[in-house]
């Protein structure tokens, strides 16, 4: 007789990350009689909602259920039918809404509110929309990685998933970087961890792990950009501000309110004579990298060692993963090979930043301009806060690894936030059953 | 399976009042944002009001000062309290998850001398 396909015991499990720039829907699906093993999770899907973060819909709430409506239906469409009601959805957002709530705390529920809303009509499980620490963020990232590596299982592999893994049970660190802010999370090597803002203690798999984390709010990619324009708009003799972090024949024009909207920028804040400026991109890497080192605050550090800003920072140990727009902006500059040295992704920065921007603009056609334009300053920013922000040197290079996705999975936080909210990361190491993954019955 | 039973309904005179339950099952009641919608005769649904899983909320122009909505998320519970009420307001009541989502069998609200 035929043997028949026994219908598939799986779960699914649903996480919405609302970033500063945009939001993305992760589908996960699991064997439901293997929850607690490691790295049995695994990405089926992610949707891109069109249109901006959660933030920016401050003023017009009433458009956040159309604006979630695409990616939920479209996860409608992958789970299967039985199984919507017992598929759970969490939105956690990140610090694009912390910003807002730090200017509002009345407009940051509203917002919430309203998404709570419009999820609570979907036939999944909702299980709450809400702002996560930015330590979260970095240890849900540092959760995520580790999973996806296999670095919590005990069963030590005799083949190697990913290019990087090495067969041993180090775990990786994490390196983060959004729009809004940036993660640093890593278990230090036998240092005490001297601010206890920064400390971690996780059981996981019968293992203890003293992690270190902190996340730099308004240390993200675009809120750095805001930071750096504030600040140097503070000392343009004019309208014009000649930019070396654009590319030289890039112009644009902006909104003095625009620049002092965000919180980030307060500290540079002051009464300008005009309500427009010009940038004018002049395309110097060396100016740039000197510009955005006046971001990081190095002559105070009340610790041991800082990273910046006063911030303390362990030594750099290990492997780490650098993943969200440190692969993104890194990829697209075709910098995520493990061969190219520090040096060399020096020297092509400063190839790329010095060409004009109608040469770049032909290169790229198929790319929007917003986000063309800005590759320079991303690039660079990078480089500025790897290598001045938190210590890696040439040498060190090598142990960052540029990573998208882990076995078909997107390298974030958002995996270890549903790992962690539905139980599925065990404090002790599960019992083997009887019947192994290798029995045949 | 998402299961909301509504309750509470029945005939009252203007002016009178009444207390609407919904009892709710098969999902995490306490994360959501719910809601009562009510059909008139003959009308389409219209929302009425909402609250969300931390309590706030919000109703429509026309029950503003008369309903209150609130929820016991120990008691898997929605209610509606209605005073002042109208002959405007006669309606078939529903809970809903969500303000669209799945919603219950209705429990039928009768307002006239």
């Known amino acids: 007789t035929q043997n028949k396909a026994l219908p598939e015991n799986v779960k699914y499990g649903i996480v919405l990350d609302a970033g500063s720039s945009h939001t993305s829907l992760y589908i996960y699906k699991w064997p439901a009689e293997k929850e607690n093993d490691t790295g049995v999770v695994h990405q089926v899907e992610e949707c891109r909602v069109k249109g901006p973060g959660i933030s920016k819909f401050v003023q017009k709430v009433n458009e956040i259920g159309i604006y979630l409506t695409d990616c939920m239906e479209r996860a409608r469409e992958v789970i299967p039918r039985s199984q919507h009601q017992e598929t759970p959805v969490y939105l956690g957002a990140t610090a694009g809404m912390r910003l807002l709530r730090m200017e509002s705390e009345e407009l940051a529920d509203r917002v919430l509110d309203v998404v709570e809303r419009s999820l609570s009509n979907y036939p999944f499980d909702f299980q709450g929309a809400r702002i996560i620490t930015g330590q979260e963020e970095g240890a849900y990232g540092w959760i995520t990685i580790n999973y996806l590596l296999g670095k919590f299982s005990q069963k030590t592999r005799w083949f190697s998933i990913v290019p990087y893994e090495t067969n041993n049970q180090e775990t990786f660190g994490a390196l983060d970087l959004g729009g809004a802010s940036t993660q640093v999370t890593f278990v230090p090597q036998n240092q005490t961890i001297e601010s206890p803002d920064n400390a971690l203690q996780f059981r996981l798999y019968g293992k203890d792990y003293n992690v270190y984390t902190h996340s730099f709010l308004c240390y993200g990619k675009d809120q750095a950009l805001w930071q750096k324009l504030a600040k140097d708009i503070q000392v343009a003799s004019n309208e014009i501000l000649r930019d070396p972090c654009f590319h030289p024949g890039y112009k644009k024009v902006v909104n003095v309110s625009d620049l002092y909207k965000t919180p980030c920028t307060k500290r540079f804040e002051m009464t300008l004579p005009f309500q427009q400026f010009e940038i004018q991109g002049i395309g110097n890497y060396q100016q740039c990298h000197q510009s955005i080192l006046e971001l990081f605050n190095t002559s105070y550090c009340p610790y041991s060692q800082c990273a910046f800003n006063g911030i303390f920072l362990p030594p750099l140990q290990g492997d780490f993963g650098a993943f969200s727009a440190f692969y993104f902006v890194m990829k697209f500059l075709n910098l995520t090979s493990e061969k190219v040295s520090q040096e060399k992704v020096t020297e092509m920065m400063k190839k790329f930043c010095a060409q004009p921007w109608e040469e770049i603009k032909t290169s790229y056609a198929g790319v929007k301009e917003k986000y063309l334009s800005e590759y320079c300053f991303s690039g660079t920013y990078i480089l500025s806060l790897l290598l001045q922000g938190y210590h890696f040197t040439a040498d060190s290079w090598e142990h960052i690894h540029f990573i998208g996705k882990i076995q078909g999975s997107d390298a974030g936080w958002t995996l270890g936030y549903m790992l962690n909210l539905t139980n599925m990361i065990p404090a002790e190491q599960p019992l083997s059953t009887p019947l192994s993954h290798s029995t045949y019955v | 399976q998402v299961k909301l039973q509504e309750s509470g309904g029945g005939w009252v005179q203007p002016g009178g009042s009444l207390r609407l339950s919904c009892a709710a099952s098969?999902?995490?009641?306490?994360?959501?944002?719910m809601s009562w919608v009510r059909q008139a005769p003959g009308q389409g649904l219209e929302w009425v009001s909402g609250i969300t899983s931390g309590g706030r909320t919000s109703y429509v122009d026309s029950v503003k000062g008369r309903f209150t909505i609130s929820r016991d998320n120990a008691a898997n519970t929605l209610y509606l309290q209605m005073n002042s009420l109208k002959p405007e307001d006669t309606a078939v009541y529903f809970c809903?998850?969500?303000?669209?989502?799945?919603r219950g069998q209705g429990t039928q609200v009768t307002v006239s001398s």
């Open positions: 809903t998850k969500g303000d669209s989502g799945a």
């Open positions: 098969g999902f995490t009641f306490r994360t959501h944002f």
